[in-house]
């Protein structure tokens, strides 16, 4: 019974990627249950804590140090066998982050994509990383790994994601590792939200008092739909940032958000999208574009919105 029924399954919650100082729960699943188990680290480093100890249901590891990084296996309790223990489990690699300077993460052609498209996530650094790892927030599977390509003092790797579907939307981070310490990863890159559009019906976008306004006049853009969207997102052509607001149910059974743009200074083309709280990174089709024109003395810029969203944060819930 070796390797099949007799082989336990070792997993990590919430993830195999653990920040330095963080905690992770290792679970050894054996014979349709969580029994007593023993834990082993393959390189034999940092194991005094496991020596001769039997754990029940799960092992909580932490606060982790770089020495915790490595490959683990477990053996499940098997009282009536010769040794009293099962065959070794699958190998589980624990990666510890926060050991080198963070790399940068970029999306080509951009982070806002239509369903079915492919996006290239490029991770790069001036640290000579041997490998790059790409990880999606909330996923317990191992991160994708690529060998770094070195050019002109920069190491980088291009991760191809696609064809895009809702399950691939979310917040991505990348990490680097140096030779000889493959599981001791860098600090995470800044988070990058990959948003998939085109999954639901488009909302409508209108301007009050109208799409053509006098300079200095207050403008509000209203995004609405019969669909019960939880959040509306407003984007302006040529701007990286989007604004988002909670949808409000109206008496006419539509769901609407009103974006106050403040005193008009110059025009622009706007679009809005709807999304649901459960899938904050999956958006509707774009509304028809709305061109806002400003007459009178044009100024160089529209005032900053009162709550500009950051490069990331789109995929967080709006409380």
């Amino acid at each position: 019974l070796m390797g099949g029924q007799d082989k336990p399954f070792l997993s990590a919650r919430p993830s195999t990627v653990v920040p330095r100082g963080g905690h992770v729960a290792l679970q050894c699943h054996y014979r349709r249950g969580f029994n007593n188990f023993m834990l082993y680290k393959e390189d034999r480093s940092h194991v005094p804590i496991f020596h001769g100890r039997i754990f029940q249901e799960s092992f909580i590891m932490g606060p982790v140090t770089p020495a915790h990084a490595g490959t683990y296996r477990c053996r499940g309790s098997r009282p009536h066998s010769l040794t009293g223990w099962s065959a070794p489990s699958n190998p589980l690699v624990i990666m510890v982050t926060g050991n080198h300077r963070k790399p940068s993460l970029l999306a080509h052609p951009g982070p806002l994509l239509k369903s079915g498209e492919t996006v290239i996530l490029q991770c790069w650094s001036d640290v000579m990383f041997e490998h790059f790892f790409l990880h999606r927030e909330g996923i317990s599977e191992d991160p994708s790994r690529l060998v770094g390509q070195i050019h002109d003092g920069v190491s980088k790797a291009n991760f191809s994601i696609g064809p895009l579907m809702p399950v691939l939307a979310g917040t991505y981070r990348c990490y680097g590792s140096v030779p000889h310490s493959p599981y001791q990863l860098s600090a995470p890159s800044d988070p990058l939200d990959i948003v998939i559009t085109g999954l639901y019906e488009k909302p409508s976008l209108s301007a009050q008092p109208g799409p053509t306004v006098q300079a200095g006049e207050n403008v509000t853009l209203s995004c609405s739909s019969w669909s019960s969207y939880d959040i509306y997102h407003l984007s302006r052509e040529g701007e990286a940032h989007e604004r988002r607001l909670r949808a409000v149910p109206k008496v006419n059974r539509t769901f609407q958000a009103d974006f106050p743009l403040g005193p008009a200074t110059h025009g622009g083309t706007y679009r809005c999208f709807g999304s649901f709280r459960a899938l904050p990174c999956v958006w509707s089709n774009s509304s028809d574009p709305l061109l806002v024109s400003v007459t009178g003395n044009p100024s160089s810029s529209w005032p900053s919105p009162t709550e500009p969203s950051s490069k990331s944060g789109i995929c967080r819930h709006l409380h």
């Epitope: 919650r13 919430p14 100082g21 963080g22 905690h23 992770v24 729960a25 679970q27 969580f34 940092h46 005094p48 804590i49 020596h51 100890r53 754990f55 029940q56 249901e57 799960s58 092992f59 909580i60 590891m61 932490g62 606060p63 140090t65 020495a67």
Partner: antibody, heavy 118, light 107 residues
Framework: QIQLVQSGSELKKPGASVKVSCKAS????????MQWVRQAPGQGLEWIGW????????KYAEDFKGRFVFSLDTSVSTAYLQISSLKAEDTAVYFC???????????WGQGTTVTVSS | DIVMTQSPSFLSASVGDRVTFTCKAS??????VAWYQQKPGQSPKLLIY???TRHTGVPDRFSGSGSGTDYTLTISSVQAEDVAVYYC?????????FGGGTKVEIK
């Protein structure tokens, strides 16, 4: 940031019970455990035991088996310590601290003073 | 149970002094030693774990070393805010046990 907030001081009579709560925030509650430590007036630190917040399995130091019970309410990220049949020698400050199977207690609650007096 | 014996139990130092506390385990604890600082009227705070790993936000004047049964905590340049009781703890095997503490006072 990680915070552990404990319930307020308790004055109890011998033989009574007390339940101390420890509400965690700033991390995923079920990825760590909760250790419990007590400190008698003017004394050092004494480990009571801990509960694995992922599996719910408790472990008690030998001297604390029986009257001391750990529990969890993961829906509100809270751990509890219940002490029954209180004795005068249970008078102490009780601390909760985040920690797991490796026994390192990296964040501590502010402590709950339990006074047992007739 | 593993017994942790701390010395000295009391230490008086001047600001800027280098001070060292020692902790002796009754058996080999394989570098599984942590150090905590407890200021008057406060809860303990983790300083060091696994003998020498500094916890997040702990100033680098605090360092730990040791192996086998003998461990030390060093403050390279004592500051007025370091007035506290310092406890060692073995996290090698349950029950986790603490030393009796070293009380640090500033002259």
């Amino acid at each position: 940031q990680i915070q552990l907030v404990q319930s307020g001081s308790e004055l109890k009579k011998p033989g009574a019970s007390v339940k101390v709560s420890c509400k965690a925030s700033g991390y995923t509650f079920t990825t760590a455990g909760m250790q419990w430590v007590r400190q008698a007036p003017g004394q050092g630190l004494e480990w009571i035991g801990w509960i694995n917040s992922h599996s719910g399995v408790p472990k008690y130091a030998e001297d604390f088996k029986g009257r001391f019970v750990f529990s969890l309410d993961t829906s509100v990220s809270t751990a509890y310590l219940q002490i029954s049949s209180l004795k005068a020698e249970d008078t102490a400050v009780y601390f909760c601290a985040r920690g797991g199977d490796e026994g390192v207690m990296d964040y501590w609650g502010q402590g709950t003073t339990v006074t047992v007096s007739s | 149970d593993i017994v942790m014996t701390q010395s000295p139990s009391f230490l008086s130092a001047s600001v800027g002094d280098r001070v060292t506390f020692t902790c002796k385990a009754s058996q080999d604890v394989s570098t599984a030693v942590a150090w905590y600082q407890q200021k008057p009227g406060q809860s303990p705070k983790l300083l060091i774990y696994w003998t020498s790993t500094r916890h997040t936000g702990v100033p680098d004047r605090f360092s730990g070393s040791g192996s086998g049964t003998d461990y030390t905590l060093t403050i390279s340049s004592v500051q007025a805010e370091d007035v506290a009781v310092y406890y060692c703890q073995q996290h090698y095997s349950t029950p986790w046990t603490f030393g009796g503490g070293t009380k640090v006072e500033i002259k």
